[in-house]
């Protein structure tokens, strides 16, 4: 039961995390205009990975896409790449983990196969979460660098007469969404990996029993090959947990509303 709960929770946490990574990637507020002393502005600028927007005092918002690919900063391209890799890995991880869920029965899939799929999806979630956290952190670092650079050159002009106030940008909501989502995906991945350990069938350590048949002495290990390798369909040689006490999961062998084919 604990294994199923850990796996299910890991899946749900990862699902929320990946949804958050997708949301963060699509959001326009990766960087927002720093308002310093002034909480109200007539023109408010904010930028995302794909477009920059301007909101006027009337509420009118105008967004312009970054229609160039080569003209964009390498760091922005790197952040885009990291976020997309995170989403792709996360999506594949979700797909794999659906089939790996212990509460879902697909044909006669063995626990060992589910364990391998759970581990695979867990690793994918971990990498996905790390990609998102890395992407957001790279962008945040870029913002901090630019913030202090623009603060140093806050006012430039002709003899102090004409001033050009440089727009400074600070952390937008998408960064926080990305960090939290990346963290959730990472946690979900770790939970999947922990669940995998509980799912993996361990070698049953029965003592070999000798059978004497027609003069030949052959030693058999009951269920040895099929149970340990996961090949074939052998429901009789199911792994026994807790020194012979079967879990609720194993008792429920009849079809239920939670079973999917």
């Amino acid at each position: 039961m604990a294994v199923t709960a850990c796996q299910g929770l890991g899946f749900v946490v990862s699902l929320i995390g990946i949804a958050g990574i997708i949301a963060a990637t699509c959001m326009d507020q990766w960087s927002t205009q720093d308002l310093y002393n002034n909480p109200v502005t007539a023109v408010f600028n904010y930028q995302g990975l794909w477009r920059s927007c301007v909101r006027e005092s009337s509420g009118f918002t105008e967004c312009r896409g970054y229609f160039t690919l080569l003209g964009l900063p390498a760091m922005l391209q790197a952040v885009r790449a990291l976020m997309i890799v995170g989403i792709v890995l996360g999506a594949i991880g979700l797909l794999v983990s659906i089939f790996a869920l212990k509460c879902i029965r697909i044909g006669s899939m063995e626990d060992s196969a589910k364990a391998n799929m759970t581990l695979t999806s867990g690793i994918m979630f971990i990498v996905s979460g790390l990609c998102a956290i890395a992407g957001v952190s790279v962008f945040a670092n870029m913002l901090v660098t630019n913030f202090w650079m623009s603060t140093a050159n806050m006012y430039t002009g002709m003899g102090g007469m004409v001033q050009t106030v440089q727009t400074r940008y600070t952390f937008g909501a998408a960064l926080f969404v990305g960090w939290v989502a990346g963290g959730l995906t990472l946690i979900g991945g770790v939970m999947m990996c922990i669940a995998c350990r509980g799912l993996a069938p361990e070698e049953t350590n029965y003592k070999a029993v000798s059978y004497h048949a027609s003069g030949h002495s052959v030693a058999y290990k009951p269920g040895g090959f099929k149970a340990s390798t996961g090949f074939g369909s052998n429901t009789k040689n199911k792994k026994i947990y807790d020194g012979g006490a079967r879990t609720e999961d194993e008792v429920q062998s009849y079809p239920s509303k939670h079973d999917y084919v």
Epitope: N45, V54, E56, F60, V165
Partner: antibody
Framework: QVQLVQSGAEVKKPGASVKVSCKAS????????MLWVRQAHGQSLEWMGN????????YYALKFQGRVTMTVDRSTSTVYMELSSLRSEDTAVYYC?????????????WGQGTLVTVSS | DIVMTQSPYSLAVSLGERATINCKSS????????????LAWYQQKPGQPPKLLIY???TRESGVPDRFTGSGSGTDFTLTISSLQAEDVAVYYC?????????FGQGTKVEIK
């Protein structure tokens, strides 16, 4: 058509308060910011502040903060501007103006103006 | 606060001639986010409220004759009346629409010579 109709001229004594109304018609009242601008005789225009009729949120020019109050009555599509502690230099024509949505913060429609005279 | 300085203070031009009004801001009115300038031009005739002519430094408001042209970027802007008509006699104001508090130029009075 869009119309902003303001209340009539007022004569006030120094230290008193004045409340000017501006009734909007011909458009969705809550969709546009309303601004107040004043103009002393023979002088330039001076922005006093604005109000968002949808939320009732206000933003005042630092010069008028503490003395000006802008309010809204959505049921009658009317905005009000109250200026307290009047002094002689507050003698001016007070205009309400609509912030033209998508017009780069420009004011596209103006009221006819309300002359406020502060005299002892 | 952004200071708006208009020149000349008054301008006398013959009918059909070109009238040019300049406006200079103490800070740039150009917004890099959308590559737009936040400057408006208004016309005010005696006893009337101001009327919007130009917004975004160069976009003519609907119904405004095409003899009115706005140009410039950053801190220097110009309003040009290509062929002055009798009905153009008024005071013209430029407005900073980029930053609060919104500020106006002192006005330029256009008269017929």
């Amino acid at each position: 058509q869009v119309q902003l109709v303001q209340s009539g001229a007022e004569v006030k004594k120094p230290g008193a308060s004045v409340k000017v109304s501006c009734k909007a018609s011909g458009y969705t009242f809550t969709d546009y910011l309303m601004l107040w601008v004043r103009q002393a005789h023979g002088q330039s225009l001076e922005w006093m502040g604005n109000i968002n009729p949808y939320y009732g949120r206000t933003y005042y020019a630092l010069k008028f903060q503490g003395r000006v109050t802008m309010t809204v009555d959505r049921s009658t599509s009317t905005v009000y501007m109250e200026l307290s502690s009047l002094r002689s230099e507050d003698t001016a024509v007070y205009y309400c103006a609509r912030d033209g949505y998508s017009l780069r913060n420009a004011m596209d429609y103006w009221g006819q103006g309300t002359l406020v005279t502060v005299s002892s | 606060d952004i200071v708006m300085t208009q020149s000349p203070y008054s301008l006398a031009v013959s009918l059909g001639e070109r009238a040019t009004i300049n406006c200079k801001s103490s800070q740039s009115l150009f917004n890099s986010g959308n590559q737009k300038n936040y400057l408006a031009w208004y016309q005010q005739k005696p006893g009337q409220p101001p009327k919007l002519l130009i917004y975004g430094a160069s976009t003519r408001e609907s119904g405004v004759p095409d003899r009115f042209t706005g140009s410039g970027s950053g801190t220097d802007f110009t309003l040009t009346i290509s062929s002055l008509q009798a009905e153009d006699v008024a005071v013209y104001y430029c407005q900073n629409a980029h930053s609060y508090p919104y500020t106006f130029g002192q006005g330029t009075k256009v008269e017929i010579k």
